[in-house]
Amino acid sequence: LDSPDRPWSPLTFSPAQLTVQEGENATFTCSLADIPDSFVLNWYRLSPRNQTDKLAAFQEDRIEPGRDRRFRVTRLPNGRDFHMSIVAARLNDSGIYLCGAIYLPPNTQINESPRAELSVTERTLEPPTQSPSPPPRLSGQLQGLVIGVTSVLVGVLLLLLLTWVLAAVFPRATRGACVCGSEDEPLKEGPDAAPVFTLDYGELDFQWREKTPEPPAPCAPEQTEYATIVFPGRPASPGRRASASSLQGAQPPSPEDGPGLWPP
């Protein structure tokens, strides 16, 4: 066999470390630097004995699912990137993953990507109003922060409730106090409101904004700022991976070329 001019470029498998909460989807991306006419792409998990267990495969524009249908491989429209997703990750899905490419004749090469680690953590936060599921990749520090912010919120709410109860029981005591906001100067909202800070790519969004107008209620002269934890429920932004299943192929494949182009 005539050896190539230059060495083969490696496969990449990213991210190198991925943390998701149980029940959420975990998505790795396997990327080919070059697209040969004919190849097989396999997705593996390393067993405790350091053996590769095949989860799913892609060949000739055919997805070959493994025994567990939760493991999905999707070819992206650029032809060289593949999303490898675990649907509804379980705690025991934590482990080491990689992809491997078998380049079929005449190239006849076997390439293996670097390994990547998946950590599936227990679900810790479940706000009652939450409709979209919390995004993946909560680090330990962030989880601590979330618990802290939640505790503060609960405390502030209890304090407000207590104030309201006191105001209701002892109305005379609050008569002299100011009412925050008036008809002349309504509370600020809209364009002048505080900026929105976004930590994206599947992390929590922290949106700091001023309290929206409410019926005048007794309060202290200093205005309280409220922190709202918002779980992203909007369409994927540039920083976050789009759902692999939402990606459409642009054109049907030309099979005689091999899988060098379009997704299935």
Partner: antibody, heavy 116, light 112 residues
Framework: EVQLVESGGDLVKPGGSLKLSCVAS????????MSWVRQTPDKRLEWVAT????????YYSDSVKGRFTISRDNAKNTLFLQMNSLKSEDTAIFYC?????????WGQGTLVTVSA | DVVITQDELSNPVTSGESVSISCRSN???????????LNWFLQRPGQSPQLLIY???TRASGVSDRFSGSGSGTDFTLEISEVRAEDVGVYYC?????????FGAGTKLELK
């Protein structure tokens, strides 16, 4: 519609050089390996060289190795074949073909004549 | 290198008849994935070669179902049923099991 248009063929003296070009259209060029195949005056087809989609690797036939260089410019959808130290046996119609080995599409060819 | 052998000329055929064109390899083109790495091309007079069959038996897109490919690891046949005038030309087989890729010398199909 897939189109491959070769150019650069000419009459050249032995020992001379020539650079062939192939402009591709109608498909995402950077997603495909590309090849050069030539047809000799006796109508035989001979594979010359192949380059991968991202230029990471290339292969050559023994008859041209060290004299010819295959390259590509994905930004310009163009495949090249730089031919040096040309010999009379290099006289042929040179075709560019899409693919590393399956050659699903071919250009119309460009004639290279090496003669004193 | 893998050597591909073809008969240079087939017997002239009458339009509407069937014809078989053979091709032989000095090495098996059957790979461990179960595929046989052989292509068939047709070059009509004055035109560039056109892919007809890839991986021994799969028709390329747009190719008439009158063309079919078969064979073992080393002996291959291209069958053309109900031959028409537009089928006239030179048929080449090509191995793609390994580099250097090699072609047969071609088989010329002529009508009576």
């Amino acid at each position: 519609e897939v189109q491959l248009v070769e150019s650069g063929g000419d009459l050249v003296k032995p020992g001379g050089s020539l650079k062939l070009s192939c402009v591709a259209s109608g498909f995402p060029f950077s997603n495909f390996g590309m090849s050069w195949v030539r047809q000799t005056p006796d109508k035989r087809l001979e594979w010359v060289a192949t380059i991968s989609s991202g230029s990471s690797y290339s292969y050559y036939s023994d008859s041209v190795k060290g004299r010819f260089t295959i390259s590509r410019d994905n930004a310009k959808n163009t495949l090249f074949l730089q031919m040096n130290s040309l010999k009379s046996e290099d006289t042929a119609i040179f075709y560019c073909a899409r693919g590393e080995s399956r050659f699903a599409y071919w250009g119309q060819g460009t004639l290279v004549t090496v003669s004193a | 290198d893998v050597v591909i052998t073809q008969d240079e000329l087939s017997n002239p055929v009458t339009s509407g008849e069937s014809v078989s064109i053979s091709c032989r390899s000095n090495k098996s083109l059957l790979y461990e994935d179960g595929q046989t790495y052989l292509n068939w091309f047709l070059q009509r007079p004055g035109q560039s070669p056109q892919l007809l069959i890839y991986l021994m038996s799969t028709r390329a897109s747009g190719v008439s179902d009158r063309f079919s490919g078969s064979g073992s690891g080393t002996d291959f046949t291209l069958e053309i049923s109900e031959v028409r005038a537009e089928d006239v030309g030179v048929y080449y087989c090509q191995q793609l099991i390994e580099y250097p890729l090699t072609f047969g010398a071609g088989t010329k199909l002529e009508l009576k």
